[in-house]
């Protein structure tokens, strides 16, 4: 029995009782030691659960009148009053006494924290973590294993294991995201350390394996087909090819390049956006040159972890047959540009030279010619040009034509040529003189004066100089008041050969000037050189004579 | 096994149509290019035609464009050779000969049907 | 189109013997596309060598291609009776064209 320690009259035992009793449970006595027994002493019971206890008001027994719940209230602190009804006063101080109440396994372990869900690479070892769950138990640790808890994989053998006492959850075997991405496990937690009679309470843990990059991209296919025009120009994109990778996002971008083409005809390029190859012509193709093509083409991921090239060593590799497709193309000429040459002179009909096209397709179309740039010139089905008027070099020394080909299967298909004719020069011009010469005589002139300096022109083409050769003519004898010297520079001086002159006996001499010159024949002219004599004054300057009006005539004419 | 036989050959009149079939067996015949080849008695080969494996594409040697056309039956996996205004020069072995998937030479031959041009 | 010239036209040898059967081309064959058969009396043609000098399936390793551009060989380093037959080579660069034939006969 235990004495309150401040009045030593109240005496009792400790207080327990069991939770969740259906019985009333009576606990125990409060006595106080003046109480002598004869009935005249009333106990009575005061504070906040008293409402849950009774007190035999005669004997102090005391007894649990409800259900009690530790885990709602597991001490009582109650006050007792011990009251002599003979004079209604109370004998004792009020004294607190406190009921404990004892724990039984009525609560199973419960999991606070739900949801669970965990993260994990694929393909991580054994023992790996990946998450620790906790359950609790509000039943009395203090008391037996109410609250001691296992933990047990209920479901997710043989992927997962739980560490007992712990709670944590490892990996206990690799695992593949391309298999299965998702894992739901179940976890039990029983407490009194799993004996008979323990409770238990179970959480799902959602596990998902994040992806990393463990699969090589493959080619969907292991023969590809694409066509390209011949006339597709450099940078046609003629196709794409794919490949598919069992990972996602960024393990999953790739890159496409060329394995093999000898060719170099070909490039890959990928759109990082569908994932796709494409095949880009890299030079153009022709049909009759080549008209299929292989490459090889191969696909890498783009991101790849060193620690993970082991999945990477052999890149998926697919053939591309290229079949290029026949256009029917215009005619093409053996050269770009023709130069063709012809003396001029040649009779109508004659061949200047021959211009070629040919149908650079298989069916190798025969060919029909037109020509355009002057009507001097025809062109035959053969590509032969011919003159249809004989050409004169002095008139024109070169011809620019044009040359149309049509395809006599297809006359749309056309092509055309410049072809420029260079007039040779032929020796069909005698020289003549190169102005018309103003001459005049002073009748004061002197014998030996400089009466006029002559030059001479040849329309033709000179393969060296011009030289010019100046004579009198023969036929011009009696002509002795004028005498000619050839300069041997192109040029002749006619001097006086008298001295004086008569304006009103003689106003005027002709004198026949032949020029000649150096060309193969050589070609001569005749020219008449008319001299006025003029009164010049006492100056002997001729400048004067021209303002006076003069009469003259001058000719000459070519032989 | 892959197995190709020829038949339609036989005797015909210059100028006269004649209709030659190669049955394909053991191989996936829609993934296939397939050709005709030539051979003039005691001559060398002579490619003819080729038709892609899905029938949207045909080539012929200049011999007898024109005049020869390709076809294929995928159903019936059967290739043909249709040949109009057939000529003496035309006399040979036609052979049907499957072009190889990763290449273009010819991996499966048939043993020929001779077509013969005379009057 | 190219035109194959294959040399010798005969080829007169004896079993055990190696053989060398050249093929020239008119232009340059793009990429190898360049293929030997052989053909004995009275059969179809037989892929020997594809690629210039991949062997075709089947093929005995005897059989061995060579060369590039414009000038091809085929070599029987020891020929057995079975391969008296003609051989002709083919290219796939630009359609479809075949040498004239070399003939292997038995010495």
């Known amino acids: 029995d235990y004495k309150d320690d401040d009045d030593k009259a109240w005496v009792w035992r400790p207080f327990v009782v069991l939770e969740e009793m259906d019985d009333i449970q009576c606990v125990g006595k409060l006595r106080s030691d003046l109480d002598n027994g004869n009935n005249s002493f009333q106990y009575k019971l005061l504070g906040i659960g008293a409402g849950s206890f009774s007190i035999n008001e005669r004997t102090g027994e005391i007894c649990a009148i409800q259900k009690l719940d530790r885990e709602e209230k597991s001490l009582y602190i109650l006050r007792a009053q011990v009251i002599d009804t003979t004079i209604g006063k109370a004998v004792e101080t009020e004294s607190e006494f406190v009921i404990r109440v004892l724990d039984i396994n009525d609560n199973e372990p419960r999991f606070l924290d739900e949801p669970y869900e965990a993260i994990v690479p694929e393909m991580s070892p054994e023992g790996t973590f990946v998450i620790k769950v906790t359950a609790n138990d509000a039943d009395d640790p203090s008391t037996g294993y109410h609250a001691r808890i296992l933990y047990n994989l209920e479901r997710g053998q043989p992927y997962f294991s739980v560490e007992p006492t712990t709670g944590v959850i490892r990996i206990s075997s690799k695992m593949d995201r391309e298999l299965q991405d998702t894992y739901c496990v179940i976890i039990q937690a029983k407490d009194m350390l799993g004996q008979p009679g323990a409770l238990s309470g179970t959480t799902t843990v959602s596990i998902k394996l994040s992806d990393i990059n463990d699969n090589k991209p493959i080619f969907k296919e292991s023969l590809y087909r694409l066509t390209v025009s011949e006339s597709a120009p450099t940078g046609t994109s003629i196709g794409t090819i794919m490949a598919y990778d069992n990972d996602i996002g960024e393990n999953a971008e790739m890159d496409y390049s060329i394995e093999e083409d000898d060719s170099q005809t070909f490039d890959i390029i990928t759109n990082h956006e569908t994932q796709e190859g494409i095949v880009i012509l890299k030079k153009k193709v022709d049909f009759e040159h080549q008209n299929h093509y292989g490459i090889r083409a191969k696909v890498k991921n783009h991101h790849v972890p060193e620690q993970l090239m082991k999945y990477h060593t052999e890149a998926s590799t697919t053939f591309i047959k290229i079949q290029v497709e026949d256009v029917d193309e215009p005619p093409v000429f053996l050269l770009p540009y023709y130069i063709l040459e012809i003396p001029e002179g040649k009779p109508y009909g004659t061949i200047v030279g021959t211009v070629s096209a040919t149908d650079p397709d298989r069916r190798q179309s025969p060919m029909r010619y037109y020509l355009t740039g002057s009507k001097m010139f025809d062109i035959n089905d053969n590509g032969t040009i011919i003159t249809t008027n004989m050409l004169d070099r002095e008139v024109s020394a070169w011809y620019n034509l044009t040359v149309t080909a049509t395809e006599t299967y297809n006359v749309q298909q056309i092509s055309s040529a410049h072809v420029y004719v260079q007039v040779f020069n032929i020796n069909d011009n005698a020289p003549e003189f190169s102005q018309f010469y103003e001459t005049y005589v002073c009748e004061n002139a002197e014998s030996g004066e400089i009466v006029q300096i002559i030059s001479a022109i040849d329309r033709d083409e000179s393969i060296e100089d011009h030289h010019f050769y100046f004579n009198h003519s023969l036929e011009d004898t009696n002509n002795s008041s004028f005498m000619l010297t050839d300069n041997q520079d192109n040029t002749a001086v006619i001097l006086s050969n008298r001295t004086g002159f008569n304006l009103k006996e003689e106003p005027v001499f002709y004198m026949i000037i032949l020029i000649a010159d150096n060309g193969i024949p050589s070609l001569t002219s005749t020219n008449t050189l008319t001299i006025q004599v003029c009164d010049c004054g006492d100056s002997r300057n001729t400048e004067t004579c021209a303002n006076k009006g003069l009469l003259f005539i001058m000719g000459f004419r070519t032989e | 096994q892959v197995q190709l036989v020829e038949s339609g050959g036989g005797v015909v009149q210059p100028g006269r149509s004649l209709r030659l079939s190669c049955a394909a067996s053991?191989?996936?015949?829609?993934?296939?290019?397939m050709h005709w080849v030539r051979q003039a008695p005691g001559k060398g080969l002579e490619w003819v035609a080729v038709?892609?494996?899905?029938?949207?594409?045909?080539y012929y040697a200049d011999s007898v464009k024109g005049r020869f056309t390709i076809s294929r039956d995928t159903s019936k996996n059967t290739l043909y050779l249709q040949m109009n205004s057939l000529r003496a020069e035309d006399t040979a072995v036609y052979y049907c000969?499957?072009?190889?998937?990763?290449?273009?030479?010819?991996?499966?031959w048939g043993q020929g049907t001779l077509v013969s041009v005379s009057s | 189109e190219i035109v194959l010239t294959q040399s010798p036209g005969t080829l007169s040898l004896s079993p055990g013997e190696r053989a060398t059967l050249s093929c020239r081309a008119s232009?340059?064959?793009?990429?190898?596309?360049l293929a030997w058969y052989h053909q004995r009396p009275g059969q179809a043609p037989r892929l020997l060598i594809y690629?210039?000098?991949s062997r075709a399936t089947g093929i005995p390793d005897r059989f061995s291609g060579s060369g590039s551009g414009t000038d091809f060989a085929l070599t029987i380093s020891s020929l057995e009776p079975e391969d008296f037959a003609v051989y002709y080579c083919?290219?796939?660069?630009?359609?479809?064209?075949f040498g004239q034939g070399t003939k292997v006969e038995i010495k």
């Open positions: 000969a499957r072009e190889r998937y990763f290449d273009w030479s010819f991996d499966y």
């Open positions: 053991g191989f996936t015949f829609s993934s296939y290019d």
């Open positions: 038709i892609s494996y899905d029938g949207t594409n045909e």
């Open positions: 232009q340059s064959v793009s990429n190898t596309y």
């Open positions: 690629g210039a000098s």
């Open positions: 083919q290219q796939y660069s630009n359609s479809w064209t």
